[in-house]
């Protein structure tokens, strides 16, 4: 058993069929010594009397909100949640495997630069009685300092016949330092609790694999004169790491007819300009790349050729 | 090349070839249907390389200041992976395909480093430790390992040449 | 000991408003969600939605947005259904339910005994 | 929504048989599952949350297993005041939804 925040406790169990469980011993935050009694949330019998109170955590029916009273007065509380081990394998009932870029994949985060800021997201299908909390570092032996916000709810969205539901959290490093190679990954831990489940998921990343710039804005179209070619420009992201001439990036530049099937002209370059032809009904596209790491492309930036 | 005792490289020369590393780096192991090697316990394996850190002056700003700190650990770092790309972890077993990439990536570290410190003039280089694996596949997972710490290194070199290039040639 | 009591039978007709009460006792109203179930004529049980007692916040199921409200006053215990816009497919015995714990909000461990609402036409 | 198919919809038993009843989602629902019995005229009680755990004061007789989208209500030994209607429930995903149900009658 093991305190995750003040008079919230976790219970290690192995679930397996009569395991054994694990014996639990409770005790009232209280001067008081007598007249002592215990109640159970979800039960409304007296469980036992006395300072402490000895239980045996074997499944969900012991776990919830331990009170102890006095002559009808609250003295403390203690929430016990369960953390189900099948097999030695931590259960992952909570959140939902994104198998994005891999399986097993349950945090999936994103940077847009390299100032040490990350956004992280997670999905589930849970609505209530669900609470998250973030941890981040970089490092875990000698872990430095990552301090992220609240997690909260972005997005809803129907798949199927289900509601999925989208949480997010923003990290920021305490002391990034953007033009460094990174030697250690950071760490981000999330603790997950559903009624009276635990689970934590974590993932392990540098910065620089999980970078992906903001689409190129400003992007225009300058017709070339008695010709079918236009002069395509564009200008680096506002939230694109300074100066862009030591945190460079690259385009890809695509002419898309409006059909999918129509063979599609792509152009790369690391210029902020291109000529193309424009075909009729064609729209433009561009996107940016990390000039000198692969990570992932920009969402695309497009204008129509009309 | 770079002439001994603080002048300025040949920052453009540098860029060039800076920049071809990267893409022969990414060509050598490219990031996508490989497992993900920091799983694979790589404390022991890689950490000994050199890395480019903050205080090397690798930053806009130390360049400015004075890029001989951050070009004595550039070339710290190629001659580093150089010596690791020649080693028996790329020449064993199991041989590299006849069209690897790792050929030229090996003569391009060899190429950069020599721009940055021509013969005669000497910066003390770091310790290759000894990574002498006995089984073929962990020759293999030091290769992937070692390929993507090589990435990592020549994007911040590449910026640096690049930023140098831009703003620091005469 | 905890009670749910519901107000009584109502007959109502097209498109009019009904209003239900479930008053609670025996325990802290704000400590545990109220939701509302509701049981068509030899039929089963659908989950309409629930209301957090402490925030006031109600949560609807799909199918139960739009002429349906919760609603509460916390100084009487009491919980509220109302029913807009009244129509024949709503005929319904409608339950209360408590939640069970702080931490488990949709199983349902206290109902009340049941109002049921009918269309007059 | 997840779909709780419960079967059988009728069950006519003797006093002293041993009754099971299932319920199977449409998806995953972890150990999220409820069972409760309903009298003739009576609001439900719960008897088993957590998909195993017995709530306060009931029989144990009454007993619920099952995990995923498996789930299992037995009554070991029916006794003559068990007839009602039973019913299982999702609580995992909103919105919450309950089988169809089971009406066990006593011959």
């Known amino acids: 058993i093991w305190e995750l925040k003040k008079d919230v406790y976790v219970v290690e169990l192995d679930w397996y069929p009569d395991a054994p469980g694990e014996m639990v011993v409770l005790t009232c935050d209280t001067p008081e010594e007598d007249g002592i009694t215990w109640t159970l949330d979800q039960s409304s019998e007296v469980l036992g009397s006395g300072k402490t109170l000895t239980i045996q955590v074997k499944e969900f029916g012991d776990a919830g909100q331990y009170t102890c009273h006095k002559g009808g007065e609250v003295l403390s509380h203690s929430l016990l949640l369960l953390h189900k081990k099948e097999d030695g394998i931590w259960s992952t009932d909570i959140l939902k495997d994104q198998k994005e870029p891999k399986n097993k994949t349950f945090l999936r985060c994103e940077a847009k630069n390299y100032s040490g800021r990350f956004t992280c997201w997670w999905l589930t299908t849970i609505s209530t009685d669900l609470t998250f909390s973030v941890k981040s570092s970089r490092g875990s032996s000698d872990p430095q300092g990552v301090t992220c916000g609240a997690a909260t709810l972005s997005a809803e969205r129907v798949r199927g016949d289900n509601k999925e539901y989208e949480y997010s959290v923003e990290c920021q490093e305490d002391s990034a330092c953007p033009a460094a190679e990174e030697s250690l990954p950071i760490e981000v831990m999330v603790d997950a609790v559903h009624k009276l489940k635990y689970e934590n998921y974590t993932s392990s990343f540098f910065i620089r694999d999980i970078i992906k710039p903001d689409p190129p804005k400003n992007l225009q179209l300058k017709p070339l004169k008695n010709s079918r070619q236009v002069e395509v420009s564009w200008e680096y992201p506002d939230t694109w790491s300074t100066p862009h001439s030591y945190f460079s990036l690259t385009f890809c530049v695509q002419v898309q007819g409006k059909s999918k099937r129509e063979k599609k002209d792509r152009v790369f370059t690391d210029k902020t300009s291109a000529t193309v032809i424009c075909r009729k009904n064609a729209s433009i596209s561009v996107r940016a790349q990390d000039r000198y790491y692969s990570s992932s492309w920009s969402e695309w930036a497009s204008v129509p050729c009309s | 090349r770079a002439v001994p005792g603080g002048s300025s490289p040949a920052w453009t020369q540098c860029q060039q070839l800076s920049q071809k590393l990267c893409t022969l780096a990414w060509s050598a192991h490219p990031l996508v249907g490989h497992m993900d090697l920091r799983e694979e316990g790589d404390e022991e394996t890689t950490n000994d390389v050199p890395h480019i850190q903050c205080g090397d002056g690798c930053d806009p700003q130390g360049l400015r200041d004075n890029s001989q700190f951050c070009l004595q650990r550039i070339h710290q770092g190629l001659i580093f992976y150089e010596k690791l790309l020649g080693s028996d972890i790329f020449t064993g077993e199991p041989s590299l395909l006849p069209d690897s990439p790792v050929g030229q990536l090996h003569a391009s570290l060899l190429g950069l480093s020599q721009l940055l410190q021509p013969e005669g003039h000497h910066w003390e280089t770091q310790q290759i430790p000894s990574l002498s694996p006995s089984q073929p596949w962990q020759r293999l997972l030091l290769r992937f390992k070692i390929l993507r710490s090589l990435q990592a290194f020549v994007a911040v070199a590449a910026r640096v040449f690049a930023h140098g290039a831009a703003t620091l040639s005469p | 000991q905890i009670q749910l009591v519901q107000s009584g039978p109502e007959l109502k007709k097209p498109g009019e408003t009904v209003k239900i009460s479930c008053k609670a006792s025996g325990y802290t109203f704000t400590n545990y969600g109220m939701n509302w179930v509701k049981q068509a004529p030899g039929k089963g049980l659908k989950w309409m939605g629930w209301?957090?007692?402490?925030?006031?916040?109600?949560t609807y199921a799909d199918d139960f947005k739009g002429r349906f409200a919760f609603s509460l006053e916390t100084s009487a215990s009491t919980a509220y259904l109302q029913i807009n816009n009244f129509k024949n497919e709503d005929t319904a015995t409608y339950f209360c339910?408590?939640?069970?714990?702080?931490?488990?909000?949709?199983?349902?461990?206290?109902w009340g005994q049941g109002t049921l609402v009918t269309v007059s036409s | 929504s997840i779909v709780m198919t419960q079967t059988p919809k009728f069950l006519l038993v003797s006093a002293g048989d041993r009754v099971t009843i299932t319920c199977k989602a449409s998806?995953?629902?972890?150990?999220?599952v409820a069972w409760y019995q309903q009298k003739p005229g009576q609001s439900p009680k719960l008897l088993i949350y957590?998909?195993?755990n017995r709530y306060t004061g009931v029989p144990d007789r009454f007993t619920g297993s099952g995990y995923g989208t498996d789930f299992t209500f037995t009554i070991s030994t029916v006794q003559a005041e068990d007839l009602a209607v039973y019913f299982c429930q999702q609580d995992y995903s909103s919105p919450y939804t309950f089988g169809g149900g089971t009406k066990l009658e006593i011959k």
């Open positions: 998806q995953s629902v972890s150990n999220d």
């Open positions: 209301i957090n007692t402490y925030t006031g916040e109600p």
């Open positions: 957590y998909a195993s």
């Open positions: 339910a408590r939640s069970l714990s702080t931490m488990i909000t949709t199983t349902f461990a206290y």
